[in-house]
Structures are given as structure tokens and as C-alpha cells.
């Protein structure tokens, strides 16, 4: 336990100020599995990178949290960055 | 309809180099195409912050650089042989999420001969 | 390198047939797989991205299926000017890789 929500806030804190405000926005559109809500705009665009992932981690638990992170981060061009949050999930 | 512009044709000869430019925004790809082949992604680049990946296969003899002012990307082919004849094309990803690539520039023909 | 396999290399069909393509990638990509059509002489054009999503533009009758390795680009009914190539690609990981194509002609 604890150890996708560590791979996801490396990850945050990893990109860039303009890398992290392209990430929230792409993450107010990305495609969600079903059955889950989006984290409201107006409470997304003011968090720093380790209360982002709490509120990944909170609302959608660590494992769809990290995948969710992971494909946000393919969407921005950061197949690497996505690949090792992935890896250090499964460890 | 985004246009990427690329200029039409290179001649080279072999063991040269030769600079493609492509106008463009975002994510830029070059992308080799031989004669009656596949495509091949050589690597791309970030016009807002310079960030690079290539393809090890072209990591050598390809450098992919942008100029900001100017919204250019280019990539530095050297050292080249009668293999890298080929179309090379940039292209755009600007669709927010899977990251395909969206808009292609016509290509630029590049052909190696002494 | 993920490997992305097309096939079949190439189908000779009649206008107004149903078209299936196929793709498939040697590890799990995920939705990551674009479709590309292109003509003689021209760039590639973006058909389908994300495995279904159209393209703006695109005419419904291209429909992109599928997830993980197998993914499948159907045309309802062929027309004269869908006689083209067309490549599969992922964007899932680096190196970005795409098939070798399926070339579309007329029987």
C-alpha cells in the first residue's frame, strides 16, 4: 500500500510548472472508466503537485489513480515519464 | 485545416548532412518514408520547452532542434547513404488525448546521390 | 520496440464491399493505436485515434475497434477514392512504431 500513490506523486513532481497546469487540464477531459466522476475544475487548478495526488488517490484509489496518471501523461507526450510511474507500481 | 510547411526536395551526396525544417507548434515527429515502404518515426520535439525522444535506430545521424521565435523544428540528417533516400514528413499532435499525430506537413524529398 | 503487425499486405475488393484491416501489436498498447490513410503522393491522414475515436472530417463509414493488441479498422462500403493505404500506429511507448500497411486495391 502507498507505493502507486508514491510512483504518482515522483511523477508530479517531475514536470514542469507549464507541464503540470497542461496535465490538470487534460486531466478535466480525459477518458474515465466507467462509473467514475472527474475531479471538479475550480478545485483541480489551484493544487500543487502532492495535493493532486492526493485527490487522484482519493478519487480514484491508487491503482486507477497511477493508470490514470499514466495515460494523462502519454496524452502530454511523456510515454517515459508514464512507462517508469508504471513499472514502479507493479514492483 | 493546420498547413506544417516543408520545403519540397534535397539532393545530397553521400556521407553529407542535411537540415529539414518544418513550420510547426507542439509536439513535432519527423517520420521517414522509403520508396514504397512504411513509416518509420525517427523522433520528436516540444517547441514550448525543447524536450526530445528519439528512436534509438536514428539517434546517431538524426538531432532535432526548434527554434521558438520562429516555430520551426529541425532535424540534422549527416552522414548519409543512399538508404536515407527516402520522404521525411513532420508532423503535428494536436489532439488532447492518445497523442496521434494530426497534421502532416507534405514532406520533404531527400535524395542521396553522388 | 512494441511491433505493430498489419494485416492483410494488401486486399483487391469491389466498390461498395465491407472492408475489415487488421493490426496487431506484440505487447498491450492499450487505446494508444491510430489509424492512417494514405494516398499516392500525399501525406498520411489521421482516420481514427485512440482505436475509436473518428477523426474531425472523417466519413462515418471508417469505424476503428479493439484494445490491448488487437485492433480492427473497418470501412462499411468501400468507395473509389478510400483505395489507399493504410497504416496502424501506437503512441502507447517510445520509439512511436507503426505497421508495415495494408494497401486497398481495386479487384
Known amino acids: 500500500m502507498g507505493r502507486a500513490r508514491d510512483a504518482i506523486l515522483d511523477a508530479l513532481e517531475n514536470l514542469t510548472a507549464e507541464e503540470l497546469a497542461a496535465f490538470k487540464l487534460k486531466l478535466l477531459s480525459v477518458p474515465l472508466r466507467e462509473g467514475y466522476g472527474r475531479i471538479p475544475r475550480g478545485a483541480l487548478l489551484s493544487m500543487d503537485a502532492l495535493d493532486l495526488t492526493d485527490k487522484l488517490v482519493s478519487f480514484y484509489l491508487e491503482t486507477y489513480g497511477a493508470e490514470l496518471t499514466a495515460n494523462v501523461l502519454r496524452d502530454m507526450g511523456l510515454q517515459e515519464m508514464a512507462g517508469q510511474l508504471q513499472a514502479a507500481t507493479h514492483q | 485545416q493546420v498547413q506544417l510547411q516543408q520545403p519540397g526536395t534535397e539532393l545530397v551526396k553521400p556521407g553529407a548532412s542535411v537540415k529539414l525544417s518544418c513550420r510547426a507548434s507542439?509536439?513535432?515527429?519527423?517520420?521517414?518514408?522509403?520508396?514504397?515502404?512504411?513509416l518509420e518515426w525517427i523522433g520528436n520535439i516540444n517547441l514550448s520547452n525543447g524536450r526530445t525522444n528519439y528512436n534509438?535506430?536514428f539517434r546517431a545521424m538524426a538531432t532535432l532542434t526548434v527554434d521558438k521565435s520562429s516555430s520551426t523544428a529541425y532535424t540534422q540528417l549527416s552522414s548519409l547513404t543512399s538508404e536515407d533516400s527516402a520522404v521525411y514528413y513532420c508532423?503535428?499532435?494536436?489532439?488532447?488525448?492518445?497523442?496521434?499525430?494530426?497534421?502532416w506537413g507534405q514532406g520533404t524529398s531527400v535524395t542521396v546521390s553522388s | 520496440n512494441i511491433v505493430m503487425t498489419q494485416y492483410p499486405k494488401s486486399m483487391s475488393l469491389s466498390i461498395g464491399e465491407r472492408v475489415t484491416l487488421r493490426c496487431k501489436a506484440s505487447?498491450?498498447?492499450?487505446?494508444?493505436v491510430s489509424w492512417y490513410q494514405q494516398k499516392p503522393e500525399q501525406s498520411p491522414k489521421l482516420l481514427i485515434y485512440?482505436?475509436?475515436n473518428r477523426y474531425t472530417g472523417v466519413p462515418d463509414r471508417f469505424t476503428g475497434s479493439g484494445s490491448a493488441t488487437d485492433f480492427i479498422l473497418t470501412i462499411t462500403s468501400v468507395q473509389a477514392e478510400d483505395l489507399a493505404d493504410y497504416h496502424c500506429g501506437q503512441s502507447y511507448n517510445y520509439p512511436l512504431t507503426f505497421g508495415a500497411g495494408t494497401k486497398l486495391e481495386l479487384k
Open positions: 505487447e498491450n498498447v492499450g487505446s494508444y
Open positions: 507542439g509536439w513535432t515527429h519527423w517520420v521517414k518514408q522509403r520508396p514504397g515502404q512504411g
Open positions: 534509438e535506430k
Open positions: 508532423a503535428n499532435s494536436m489532439v488532447p488525448h492518445f497523442f496521434p499525430m494530426d497534421y
Open positions: 485512440g482505436a475509436s
